[in-house]
């Protein structure tokens, strides 16, 4: 807390300019009018204030706006944003995408801080859903943003927003998140033709059920091995050798190199050895010829 002291004669700030960098903390407190600061916030960024001086400026704004800053001030906070606590940010009502962009720019190149996370949360909640423009903005600054949301939060993403998602935005998503996103992507891209549809849906396929994979296998898609290995194991296991062969096309040859990794390993164990032999890869570990395969899960369902 800076002591309340009178402003020395002739030092009263008429505008926010470079001369203020020579003011001591107490002089800033005494000589800078909070209302003036609020109207000239855009100038603060251009002036090389010390961290201590910025603390004083923040304190002045806090006194002026105890219920939270107005958006006109928030938009021009610049580096002063880094001084804000999540508690400060929870008092704000940010509705403009331009304000959000301006503040994200300040934190650009750094990990998502608690301040940024709170800001995004306030912004999205204020909008009611994660629309395309917001998603575009957030993933541009934080490619991993989408995968940081819970499946519940992702359920508020409208299918139309899926168009903004790039493959790299889904890199860190787990199967539960893709389970939520995949049906939305399927809906969003439903009017595209075969090859274009596959290009768009490919990144979301970690949430695809078996029947969709079977359908894709009929479309000459040539899925690459990295995509195949991100599929749900339970969705891959029921696929036949012929279906996997059609799904992967020329990339099926890479199964040999990945035979020890899931879901390839588990899938191999479920196939007949003579079917595996048709792949021409020397894959071993399938069900020997002449063995009878009982589907116990089916039996349990019937009893």
């Amino acid at each position: 807390e800076v002591e309340k002291t009178a402003c020395p004669s002739g030092k009263k700030a008429r505008e926010i300019d470079e001369s203020l960098i020579f003011y001591k903390k107490w002089e800033l407190e005494a000589c800078v009018d909070a209302a003036l600061l609020a109207t000239q916030m855009d100038r603060v960024n251009a002036i090389p204030f010390t961290y201590e001086q910025l603390d004083v400026l923040k304190h002045k704004l806090d006194e002026l706006y105890p219920q939270g800053y107005p958006e006109s001030v928030i938009q021009h906070l610049g580096y002063l944003f880094l001084k804000m606590s999540p508690e400060d940010i929870r008092k704000w009502n940010v509705t403009s995408l331009e304000t959000l962009k301006a503040l994200l720019e300040v934190n650009k190149g750094h990990e998502m801080s608690p301040q940024v996370a709170t800001l995004i949360d306030r912004f999205v909640k204020g909008r009611g859903q994660l629309d395309k423009d917001t998603l575009d903005t957030l993933t541009a600054f934080y490619p991993g943003y989408l995968c940081s949301l819970s499946p519940e939060e992702l359920s508020s993403v409208p299918p139309s927003s899926i168009w903004a998602v790039r493959p790299q935005d889904l890199d860190t998503c787990d199967p539960r998140q893709l389970d939520v996103l995949y049906p939305k992507a399927r809906l969003a891209f439903q009017n595209m033709n075969g090859s274009e549809y596959f290009v768009k849906i490919q990144s979301f396929l970690g949430g695809a059920p078996t029947e969709d994979l079977k359908a894709l296998s009929q479309q000459n898609v040539s899925m690459d091995l990295a995509t195949f290995m991100k599929l749900r194991t339970d969705a891959v296991l029921p696929l036949t050798v012929a279906e996997v062969q059609k799904l992967l096309g020329p990339h099926v040859e890479g199964l040999k190199a990945e035979e020890r990794h899931r879901p390839v390993r588990d899938w191999i164990l479920r196939q007949r050895q003579d079917d595996l032999d048709t792949l021409g890869l020397g894959l071993q570990g399938g069900i020997p010829n002449g063995y009878l395969v009982l589907d116990l899960s089916m039996q349990e369902a019937l009893s």
């Epitope: 091995l225 990295a226 990945e258 990794h261 792949l279 021409g280």
Partner: antibody
């Protein structure tokens, strides 16, 4: 030891077709796919396509789809590539190579298209 | 198609020197599930066919001398030859087998001073 034997040279006239061979030995022929690669003098390498010797499935680089046809004869452990409607642009060394990693290569066949 | 770019296109070094060549791909070659990069390096000596040196970006093929070291991940890869020998005179190609059509870099020609 693994060997992929290819004839050294082929001389053909423009407009004709040629069938290049690659005889494999020293491993189970049906356990590795066979790839074909083109190399023009002083230039880089281009992947033409591959074939599954077990069932004859083929996949081609779009660029060579109307130029190359890949086949195999399991009984002689030999892979073939037929090139059609030959022009001087097809003059190159053609290699067969084993498997996804291309871990063994034939010595290459030098194809010369000239009238 | 994935574009593979190699640099330099040629370099000349003395026997015993260390040499480094680069290969960049236009998209990531990493399979994040298995943590394998689908990139291989080949050596082609004058008048011979290519020979596999390194696969999965850093795994040496059997019989390849220890002086050959592959490294890198994603889109940037390097082949290093520690203490170059006269028999290393050759063209070196990188190749992606992440997706078809499988594509090769333009090559780096290694000459011995």
């Amino acid at each position: 030891q693994v060997q992929l034997q290819q004839p050294g040279t082929e001389l053909v006239t423009p407009g004709a077709s040629v069938k290049l061979s690659c005889k494999a030995s020293g491993y189970s022929f049906t356990s590795y796919w066979m790839h074909w690669v083109k190399q023009r003098p002083g230039q880089g390498l281009e992947w033409i396509g591959n074939i599954n010797p077990s069932n004859g499935d083929t996949f081609y680089n779009e660029k060579f789809k109307n130029k190359a046809t890949l086949t195999v004869d399991k009984s002689s452990s030999t892979a073939y590539m037929q090139l059609s409607s030959l022009t001087s642009e097809d003059s190159a060394v053609y290699y067969c190579a084993r498997g996804w990693l291309r871990d063994y290569w034939g010595q290459g066949t030098t194809l010369t298209v000239s009238s | 198609d994935i574009v593979m770019t190699q640099s330099p296109s040629s370099l000349a070094v003395s026997v015993g020197q260390k040499v480094t060549m680069s290969c960049k791909s236009s998209q990531s070659l990493l399979n994040s599930s298995s943590q394998k990069n689908y990139l291989a390096w080949y050596q082609q000596k004058p008048g011979q066919s290519p020979k596999l040196l390194v696969y999965f970006a850093s795994t040496k093929d059997s019989g390849v001398p220890d002086r050959f070291i592959g490294s890198g991940s994603g889109t940037d890869f390097t082949l290093t030859i520690n203490s170059v020998q006269a028999e290393d005179l050759a063209d070196y190609f990188c190749q992606q087998h992440y997706t078809t059509p499988y594509t090769f870099g333009g090559g780096t020609k290694l000459e011995i001073k």
